[in-house]
């Protein structure tokens, strides 16, 4: 798990875009708002994040949705689906 640290000045992500590929894991944790991530999940799939960076994004979604992801997020998981465990998937209420 990435240590909680304050986001450096000027690094708060206003949107999910390719500039985030230069963020270290702790910066993604500190500077990307989970609710913003959830609403812009469709963008994640077009950005060449490393496997480790995807771990951080998954962790943020897990904190935002401890009971399971909503369908709006599930539909746009893309490569992040590879990070999902059977336990994660069992929480989903997919119709």
């Amino acid at each position: 798990e990435v240590e909680k640290t304050a986001c450096p000045s000027g690094k708060k992500a206003p949107e999910i875009d390719e500039s985030l590929i230069f963020y270290k894991k702790w910066e993604l944790e500190a500077c990307v708002d989970a609710a913003l991530l959830a609403t812009q999940m469709d963008r994640v799939n077009a950005i060449p994040f490393t496997y480790e960076q995807l771990d951080v994004l998954k962790h943020k979604l897990d904190e935002l949705y401890p009971q399971g992801y909503p369908e709006s997020v599930i539909q746009h998981l893309g490569y992040l689906f590879l990070k999902m465990s059977p336990e994660d998937i069992r929480k989903w209420n997919v119709t």
Epitope: I21, N45, P48, F49, T50, Y51, G78, Y79
Partner: nanobody
Framework: QVQLVESGGGLVQAGGSLRLSCTAS????????MGWYRQEAPGKERELVA????????NYADSVKGRFTISRDNAKNTVYLQMNSLKSEDTGVYYC?????????WGQGTQVTVSS
Amino acid sequence: QVQLVESGGGLVQAGGSLRLSCTASESGFSANYMGWYRQEAPGKERELVATINRFGSTNYADSVKGRFTISRDNAKNTVYLQMNSLKSEDTGVYYCRIMRPGNWYWGQGTQVTVSS
């Protein structure tokens, strides 16, 4: 699977220069968006230091701006990282990567050691 082979690393004094090369086996190399990453130590995170897209547009991590230059030679299927004014904190294994979503393949890397 595309093979990436990095080379050009070595031991250099602080303030010195090195030029790294990454050669790809893929014939459509010119279409690839490429990046160089640095890993300071085994088990530590690989940090992106520079990228170059197929049009030659470049981006750099703040820590290397003005010191490192990424370039490419599509005829040779090769991307380069010219590293000047090297610092001890630049020490690590350098890897190139095809910057493609869902691509997590890495070459063997090339070790750069900067002594102070």
